[in-house]
């Protein structure tokens, strides 16, 4: 490797440290090195080595303390089940290669919970969930034996305990001991055995973290009955007074490094964004630390619940702020959190016991000073009266999430700090900061929030429909007349909003094809609902060949759409979803939404067009201020409108106008774009304000969009604020919460 030519700033030679089949990189200014292997391989016998004061690298020792002469990259294997109760697994093997499958089967009288088939993944973990054969005889259900662990205890009565342990050399993550609790749930969280080379994939972390965080945020009433043996989901009442504090604790020590610190900041910005998207307004505390902690935002500050302001503070933090004192004192950092939680003069304020506390710690897990931080977690639990009363343990009031980043993470340390809750994961180990950034991109848009409107997956790996998941393609086949292409927008699980002119009264439902999410299959149509005031021939007598007022229609689907990352609704004006999306108070009125989305000025907006089979966003400006009049007057250049005396005859108050060259040269819509949404993008959310209706100039005559277009090339869109009574009536059963 090229490294053999360089000499680290530390005092260890790089002679002979190479790894067979891989490479290495220096960490901590040459005081440590990390072996790097190709995907599907891991460094044997160790992943990292430290430069000792004697000037030599730490020895290559196997798990059973044998010394190895040279490091090598070995194929990653998944562990075998050490035991499986009340059933069998096949095939048998000492270990399983990546992509090998294992199947579980239960004996008569036992039901399989979890995954019957699991596949060995490239990170050395099994896909799916722990397979458990249970006969429902216990007060609690069988907690199972996660692959690679061993369980002691097979009685599942109230207050019975089971303990887990790992084979030599593996670290237990999760709970070593779990107790069967009142209500039929197990204390703690499912354990797993981790090898040093094992990392959580971004997808695993995003799913697990988000589903746990959602449990905390999306609170519903806890008075939910559940019988013994049922899995009890954590249910939380969030009272509207903003009873949640989130403490973001960021390691800024030497071992983290500047680029990782910047990456971690990005992750937390995404997290704040995500939480805001749920429509809750927690108070934030923001702490960075090295040798000493620095509190940037206190939960007691007036603006601590203003997500935008907290994000601004976070963005202004510099890694250099801790440069002079760059140890890792996690204990002191958590003490800073404790100080924010505690109350002056030890007098608890009104409602202290209804506040949920979430600590999110990002670290490389290497505290090297100040003592064991777990003691502070214990103090916090005491302060919040958690785990003291068996009848009301209050575990829901504290969640500690720990993100360990990089090869030096001490798994035992981070596991000790993290919360342990049934069916949830609070401790994560990711390979590097790029992986953690991936997590937070994925998390910004994961399963629990699929019903949120106007959310997209802006990640670099996303497809067209990840980025425009509401976009629908519509085509109408007319025998002997060819076919008409239009666009539309998914607005609910049963409805697509589009333009009325895409259809004629003679079009039959079976001749209308709608596809969403980039899927090849067409959706079955139940009915097309036109706005009752739409009549394309309404002004023929007045010499206006085509009249597009109220040019909107709703397509009702026969079957409910299954939301996913590539199919989800856009936000509609004057709905509760849009109030939350814009982070406005719940008392916001329709008029206030209108002022926010369509102020009297040039409004930056976008539409989605298909070019060469790719969906692209086109940025335009809605002329809603001083340019509105001239924009509308250009309608006279439209074919058939040249004889219109008063342009308001064709450009009614129902229209929004885009196009032209001022303030910028706007791209124009094409025929196939009709019916698609005109969108305002605000606060990382997408709100539909219009439906594309008609244009003055056909800029796409020969299947190609013309580059040079006249200044009078304008486009007109139906303003959704003007057709709200109709939308509200037709979508009344869709749970959109119209204001």
């Amino acid at each position: 490797t090229p490294w053999s030519l360089a000499r680290p700033q530390g005092s260890c030679s790089l002679e002979g440290v190479e790894i067979k089949g891989g490479s290495f990189r220096l960490l901590q200014e040459g005081q440590a090195l990390e072996y790097v292997c190709p995907s599907g391989f891991y460094p044997y016998p160790v992943q990292t080595r430290t430069c000792r004061s004697t000037g030599s690298w730490s020895t290559l020792k196997t798990q059973d303390q044998k010394t190895v002469r040279k490091a090598e990259c070995r194929a990653i294997h998944c562990p075998r089940p050490h035991d499986f109760e009340n059933g069998e697994y096949w095939p048998r093997s000492p270990y399983y290669n990546v992509s090998d499958e294992i199947s579980f089967h239960c004996y008569d009288g036992y039901t399989l919970r979890g995954s019957a088939n699991r596949t060995c993944q490239v990170n050395g973990r099994w896909s799916g969930q722990t397979a458990i054969c249970d006969n429902g005889a216990g007060y609690c259900s069988n907690p199972g034996i996660p692959i690679g662990t061993r369980k002691v205890g097979s009685q599942y009565r109230l207050e019975d305990s089971v303990t887990y342990h790992c084979s030599r050399g593996l670290t237990l993550r999760g709970s070593q001991r779990r107790t069967c609790q009142e209500g039929g749930s197990w204390s703690g969280t499912e354990p797993s055995c981790q090898d040093s080379f094992m990392y959580d994939t971004p997808q695993e972390v995003a799913e697990a973290f988000l589903s746990s965080l959602t449990e905390t945020i999306e609170g519903v009433d806890a008075e939910d009955g559940h019988g013994p043996g049922e899995q009890q989901k954590r249910k939380i009442v969030l009272d509207p007074s903003g009873s949640m504090n989130i403490y973001l604790v960021l390691d800024g020590s030497d071992s983290i490094g500047a680029s990782n610190f910047t990456g971690a900041k990005k992750c937390l910005v995404n997290l704040i964004e995500k939480v805001a998207s749920y429509g809750v307004k927690p108070r934030y505390g923001l702490v960075t630390y090295a040798t000493y902690p620095k509190i940037w935002v206190k939960v007691s500050e007036a603006d601590s619940s203003n997500a935008d302001w907290v994000t601004k503070q976070l963005n202004e933090i510099n890694y250099e702020d801790h440069k002079l004192k760059s140890g890792t004192n996690t204990k002191k950092a958590l003490q800073a959190v404790y100080s924010m939680m505690s109350w002056p003069d030890d007098v608890p304020p009104e409602g202290w016991n209804r506040t949920r506390h979430v600590i999110i710690l990002m670290t490389d897990g290497l505290h090297n000073m100040g003592g064991d931080p777990i003691t502070v977690i214990d103090e916090i639990r005491d302060l919040l009266y958690i785990g003291k009363d068996r009848k009301n343990p209050r575990e829901d009031y504290l969640d500690v999430y720990v993100f360990g980043v990089g090869p030096l993470v001490n798994q035992v340390n981070i596991n000790a700090l993290a919360s342990k809750k049934d069916n949830e994961q609070h401790v994560f180990k990711v390979k590097d900061m790029e992986n953690l950034e991936d997590v937070f991109y994925q998390m910004i848009d994961e399963s629990q929030s699929l019903s949120l409107c106007g959310m997209v997956w802006e990640h670099r790996k996303g497809t067209d429909y990840h980025k425009q998941p509401w976009q629908a393609k519509i085509s109408v086949i007319r025998p002997s007349k060819g076919h008409e292409s239009c666009m539309g927008a998914v607005v609910s699980e049963y409805f697509v909003l589009t333009a009325a002119h895409c259809f004629t009264v003679d079009d039959k439902e079976h001749s209308i094809k709608v596809s969403v999410g980039g899927e090849k299959r067409d959706l079955e149509i139940e009915v097309v609902l036109f706005h009752p005031n739409y009549n394309i021939n309404g002004k023929k007598e007045a010499g206006i060949p085509e009249f597009y007022d109220y040019d909107v229609a709703l397509i009702k689907l026969k079957n409910k759409l299954k939301y996913g990352q590539t199919i989800r609704p856009i936000c509609l004006p004057c709905t509760e979803g849009t109030t939350r999306a814009l982070r406005l108070p719940p008392t916001t009125t329709c008029q206030q939404q209108k002022e926010e989305l369509l102020p009297a000025q040039d409004i930056k907006a976008l539409f989605v067009s298909e070019e060469e089979k790719k969906l692209t966003r086109k940025e335009v400006y809605i002329k809603n201020g001083d340019k509105k009049g001239s924009c509308e007057r250009d309608a006279q250049y439209a074919p058939g409108y040249d004889k219109v005396k008063d342009i308001s005859e064709v450009v009614t108050p129902r229209f929004l106008c885009t196009g032209g060259v001022s303030p910028y040269a706007d791209p124009n819509t094409c025929r196939g774009d009709s019916g698609g949404p005109l969108i305002v993008h605000k606060r990382s959310r997408f709100i539909q304000v219009g439906v594309i209706s008609w244009g003055v100039v056909d800029v796409c005559k020969n299947q190609k969009r013309q580059k040079q277009v006249p200044a009078h090339a304008r486009d007109f869109h139906i303003n959704l604020f003007q057709v709200l009574p109709w939308l509200k009536e037709k979508l009344q059963d869709e749970d959109l919460g119209f204001l």
Epitope: W90, R92, S93, H105
Partner: antibody, heavy 119, light 112 residues
Framework: EVQLLESGGGLVQPGGSLRLSCAAS????????MNWVRQAPGKGLEWVAV????????YYSDSVKGRFTISRDNSKNTLYLQMNSLRAEDTAVYYC????????????WGQGTLVTVSS | QSVLTQPPSASGTPGQRVTISCTGS?????????VHWYQQLPGTAPKLLIY???KRPSGVPDRFSGSNSGTSASLAISGLRSEDEADYYC????????????FGGGTKLTVL
């Protein structure tokens, strides 16, 4: 009552073949993996083969691999052992045994059938 | 030559505690595979006595217990009785040669 009953044993010449059967009753046969274990006269137990509950996975001891075939017919609740190219050292009482649990403990045994390989 | 090594014989007087050892290697007990113990009374088929190192099937008295550590396992019988006179076999999965079950050579327990 859970029961296993072996049959098909007897005297056979070296190089000859024999097919053992094991009839299961009192439990859902198709749910369990099954084994053949043998015991030479005056000697200890020697495992021969195992077959998974659905017959998809089979493992043999080295001493019989290529000569013996374990199979099952779940519709008939029967386990089989087809023994070819028999040798004198295959002389033993052959037991069929049910496996239980992830570590394949043999919790139910038949009474055994004697196979004698001799010229 | 058995893969798992057991003493050929053991003895004890009624009421005494006896232990039978079973030594394996890194491909069976040492690899973490659980050990099972079987009892074979004279002229009968074997019977499962202990499974998964230390679990007792129903009907087996708690005088019988199993344990294991490293590459070996042991069966302990306390309060020895005359009806305990039998052959005892340990068994475990072994991951060599594509996987197989291996037995110990057996220990003949005599109650004096």
């Amino acid at each position: 009552e859970v029961q296993l009953l072996e049959s098909g044993g007897g005297l056979v010449q070296p190089g000859g073949s024999l097919r053992l059967s094991c009839a299961a009753s009192g439990f859902t046969f198709s749910s369990y993996s099954m084994n053949w274990v043998r015991q030479a006269p005056g000697k200890g137990l020697e495992w021969v083969a195992v077959i998974s509950y659905d017959g998809r996975f089979i493992y043999y001891s080295d001493s019989v691999k290529g000569r013996f075939t374990i199979s099952r017919d779940n519709s008939k609740n029967t386990l089989y052992l087809q023994m070819n190219s028999l040798r004198a050292e295959d002389t033993a009482v052959y037991y069929c045994a049910r496996s239980y649990g992830g570590n394949l403990a043999m919790d139910v045994w038949g009474q055994g059938t004697l196979v004698t390989v001799s010229s | 030559q058995s893969v798992l090594t057991q003493p050929p014989s053991a003895s004890g007087t009624p009421g005494q505690r006896v232990t039978i050892s079973c030594t394996g290697s890194s491909s069976n007990i040492g690899a973490g595979y659980d050990v099972h113990w079987y009892q074979q009374l004279p002229g009968t088929a074997p019977k499962l006595l202990i499974y998964d190192n230390n679990k007792r099937p129903s009907g087996v008295p708690d005088r019988f217990s199993g344990s294991n550590s490293g590459t070996s396992a042991s069966l302990a019988i306390s309060g020895l009785r005359s009806e305990d006179e039998a052959d005892y076999y340990c068994a475990a999965w072994d991951d060599r040669l594509n996987g197989r079950v291996v037995f110990g050579g057996g220990t003949k327990l005599t109650v004096l």
